[in-house]
Interface confidence: low
């Protein structure tokens, strides 16, 4: 059957798109790469806005392969520096804490779901 | 081919500012980092900070920080360097470089340089 | 910052000869998520601006000739030119851009008896 626009903005596709394109630094071309900084920056400013973190929350950084992890592994990074709770300077107010995973010091929410609630009123 | 064009050239009065040029060819101008560069005799090179023109972040060697501005106008391509309060250390060449593949940090490409002399 | 710490400050050599100038590090400029070190070495010929001759330590620019090899990881850094030409005569530079801001040796001038 056709798709719909409505299959298109589904948490997969946002997904997929994450994994594959943030912070992804080894692309095969420059038009690939100037994609990868687009999505990249888009999910920093999404999840520094909606304070946010991945497309279901900072379980995405841990359960798939990406090339997030590719480029930062586990132990320095779990999630990006934007799941951290930030100072008015948009600092992590304790970027220790917020890789320890230390409630309160980053967010748990998918970004997703903040996305997807106002679209899906229309 | 990847250009970046500088004047060869800038004579200017201490205490007063100045704007560097470099006009970007060749290549999707929003596409890559522009970084800019000092060089002086003795010092050697002095990487003065970087703007993304796609959206004008910067950063600034905190050295710097109060001396230049970086900027962009996209729609003729061209980077901007503004450095300000000239004093005579700050007679140098200045170079525009642009990034490598994409967020590739090594400078890629280089301007000529251009020469700013402060002298009264 | 990171300081670049380059050796010897100049060298003179013989055309045929081997070259081997060092670049040392404050800090390691190892991505230990890519496993990249994030250090380039740059050329500067007379009267030009720098060109760049090897990224991520070891990887050469398109162009640059295979007598240029660089080689070294974490905070040691090696530059050698295997077979030097004349057309070497040059400052080389090494940098650091694994963090802002990103900072330069102070460069190694080579000259050619």
């Known amino acids: 059957t056709a798709a719909t626009q409505q299959d298109f903005f589904t948490p997969n596709l946002f997904l997929k798109q994450m994994l594959e394109r943030y912070q992804n630094n080894s692309p095969p071309n420059n038009d690939d790469q100037w994609k990868n900084n687009g999505v990249t920056k888009t999910w920093d400013r999404l999840m520094l806005q909606d304070n946010c973190c991945g497309v279901n929350g900072p379980s995405d950084w841990q359960k798939y392969t990406s090339a997030f992890r590719t480029e930062n592994n586990d132990a320095d990074y779990p999630w990006p520096r934007q799941c951290c709770v930030m100072n008015n300077l948009k600092e992590p107010l304790n970027l220790e804490a917020c890789k320890l995973g230390v409630p309160g010091f980053y967010h748990n929410q998918g970004c997703y779901e903040l996305i997807s609630g106002p679209m899906n009123r229309h | 081919q990847v250009q970046l064009q500088q004047p060869g050239a800038e004579l200017v009065r201490p205490g007063s500012s100045v704007k560097v040029s470099c006009k970007a060819s060749?290549?999707?101008?929003?596409?890559?980092?522009m970084h800019w560069v000092k060089q002086r005799p003795i010092q050697g090179l002095e990487w003065i900070g970087n703007?993304?023109?796609?959206?004008?972040?910067?950063h600034y060697n905190q050295k710097f920080k109060d001396k230049a501005t970086l900027t962009v106008d996209k729609s003729s391509s061209t980077a901007y360097m503004q450095l300000s309060s000239l004093t005579s250390e700050d007679s140098a060449v200045y170079y525009c470089?642009?990034?490598?593949?994409?967020?590739?940090?090594?400078?890629?490409?280089w301007g000529q340089g251009t020469l700013v002399t402060v002298s009264a | 910052d990171i300081v670049m710490t380059q050796s010897p400050s100049s060298l003179t050599v013989t055309a045929g000869e081997k070259v081997t100038m060092t670049c040392k590090s404050s800090q390691s400029l190892l991505n230990s998520g890519n496993q990249k070190n994030y250090l380039t070495w740059y050329q500067q010929k007379p009267g030009q601006p720098p060109n760049p001759l090897i990224y991520w330590a070891s990887t050469r620019e398109s162009g640059v000739p295979d007598r240029f090899t660089g080689s070294g990881s974490g905070t040691d850094f090696t530059l050698t030119i295997s077979s030097v030409q004349a057309e070497d005569l040059a400052v080389y530079y090494c940098q650091n851009d694994y963090s802002y801001p990103f900072t330069f040796g102070s460069g190694t001038k080579l000259e050619i008896k």
């Open positions: 703007i993304d023109p796609s959206d004008s972040e910067t």
């Open positions: 470089a642009r990034s490598g593949a994409g967020t590739g940090p090594w400078l890629a490409y």
């Open positions: 060749g290549y999707t101008f929003s596409s890559y980092w």
